[in-house]
């Protein structure tokens, strides 16, 4: 457990930019939590560099990260989940840079899954449903979800809808008829815990019905 690098130490190492970012995932593997860190500069020579977390841990002073190609990773039950930990980039016993981080403020949820869209002919709408592993978790249970959809031909014209449930209704009249749509969803912590958006779920593709000329309504596919 060593402090910050002193001036004059580490010679050339001090000239490099060792800034890094981290995210935590709670109960990602049963009751195990994970912490993932990576350098912001992809060109940093990571050969002799290690990451260490100290403080706000259960019955240990510090834990060392495992290196997995370009990222550094810990999986453990030993996070207190309160207060700030000291996360340091180290070469040997010397700390090159350190950050104090509260792991409850850098939570990245797991991506939602099982996204599907069902057309309801009688209601003239589409019911979007998806699942999240967080419904079963003890900690990060309350999430805000961001459902994004677009007409497949409109590459960057995404429409976003924020919701706290895992079900959304899209009105048929708000969508173009006889069009192919792509839809996806991601999540972010929304109560007590803070952090980042999850990865996007796999996209789901669906086609809107044609308009029925006599009634002005869309035909089911």
């Amino acid at each position: 457990e060593s402090g910050y690098a002193q001036n004059g130490d580490l010679e050339d190492a001090e000239l490099d930019d060792y800034s890094f970012s981290c995210y935590s995932q709670l109960e990602v593997n049963g009751s195990q939590h994970s912490l993932t860190c990576a350098f912001e500069d992809p060109d940093v020579n990571i050969t002799n560099l290690e990451f260490e977390i100290c403080g706000a841990l259960v019955e240990v002073k510090c834990l060392n990260f495992r290196k997995l190609q370009e990222i550094y990773f810990i999986e453990t039950k030993k996070f207190l989940l309160i207060g700030k930990s000291n996360i340091c980039v180290k070469v040997g016993e010397k700390s090159l840079t350190c950050k104090k981080i509260d792991l409850t403020t850098i939570v990245k949820p797991e991506a939602p899954f099982d996204l599907s869209v069902v057309y309801r002919e009688g209601a003239n709408d589409f019911v979007v449903t998806f699942n999240t592993s967080h419904l079963q978790k003890k900690y990060v249970k309350v999430l805000m979800h961001d459902v994004a959809y677009r007409q497949e031909k409109d590459e960057n014209k995404w429409t976003h809808v924020n919701l706290s449930s895992t079900k959304l209704t899209l009105l048929q009249r708000k969508l173009q008829p006889a069009a192919m749509y792509e839809i996806k969803v991601r999540s972010i912590p929304d109560h007590y815990f803070k952090g980042f958006w999850s990865e996007w779920s796999p996209s789901y593709y669906f086609r809107t019905p044609e308009i029925n000329n006599s009634s002005g309504e869309m035909d089911p596919i």
């Epitope: 457990e1 100290c54 403080g55 510090c62 309160i82 207060g83 700030k84 104090k100």
Partner: antibody, heavy 119, light 105 residues
Framework: EVQLQQSGPELLKPGASMKISCKAS????????MNWVKQSHGKNLEWIGL????????SYNQKFKGKATLTVAKSSSTAYMELLSLTSEDSAVYYC????????????WGAGTTVTVSS | EIVLTQSPAITAASLGQKVTITCSAS?????MHWYQQKSGTSPKPWIY???KLASGVPVRFSGSGSGTSYSLTISSMEAEDAAIYYC????????FGGGTKLEIK
């Protein structure tokens, strides 16, 4: 005003067990760890353990594992320390102390509970 | 487990005198805290994270150090400073030093 109010002094026989309470007021109880510290002979301070009131996660000094058990009642903002199988070595003043999670020092202390173990 | 050794164990200082109390760690410590305790009362946070003064602590107090050597300094001793001072490491298992008793000469 942030305060930690501890239960009163105790005189106990060897082999007995007892529970000290520490009622917190004036702050968000679940936002800080609650720590327990033993002071023997008016001098030596020893950290016993802590509890995160938000989730009940505990961390103990190895020396006090099996001797002390930490719990909380969130509804009443009260922390408890149970001391088991008391001996004369457990005679001491016991403090609860709020842990500042930014710097990991004990920023607010209770007045202490004197425990005397004697036959 | 880190051992914190405070020196001197007891010291006496005249009013107005500069006082330095040291805390030596058996291995490197990132941050050190200091507490003041007067007879019959609970410890009070005095200096945290090496050099930050706790609320209400007079500016004649200062803290410094790194690695295995830390110190608390009083620039000019006053009567109310007579007390026992404890150092404490910031991390598990939050070990305290044995204390330095500061008296008035």
């Amino acid at each position: 005003e942030v305060q930690l109010q501890q239960s009163g002094p105790e005189l106990l026989k060897p082999g007995a067990s007892m529970k000290i309470s520490c009622k917190a007021s004036g702050y968000s109880f679940t936002g800080y760890t609650m720590n327990w510290v033993k002071q023997s002979h008016g001098k030596n301070l020893e950290w016993i353990g802590l509890i995160n009131p938000y989730n009940g996660v505990t961390s103990y000094n190895q020396k006090f594992k099996g001797k002390a058990t930490l719990t909380v009642a969130k509804s009443s903002s009260t922390a408890y320390m149970e001391l088991l199988s008391l001996t004369s070595e457990d005679s001491a003043v016991y403090y609860c102390a709020r842990g500042d999670g930014n710097y990991w020092y004990f920023d607010v202390w209770g007045a202490g509970t004197t425990v005397t173990v004697s036959s | 487990e880190i051992v914190l050794t405070q020196s001197p164990a007891i010291t006496a200082a005249s009013l107005g005198q500069k006082v330095t109390i040291t805390c030596s760690a058996s291995s490197s410590v990132t941050y050190m805290h200091w507490y003041q305790q007067k007879s019959g009362t609970s410890p009070k946070p005095w200096i945290y994270e090496i050099s930050k003064l706790a609320s209400g602590v007079p500016v004649r107090f200062s803290g410094s150090g790194s690695g295995t050597s830390y110190s608390l300094t009083i620039s000019s001793m006053e009567a109310e400073d007579a007390a026992i001072y404890y150092c404490q490491e910031w991390n598990y298992p939050y070990t305290f030093g044995g204390g330095t008793k500061l008296e008035i000469k």
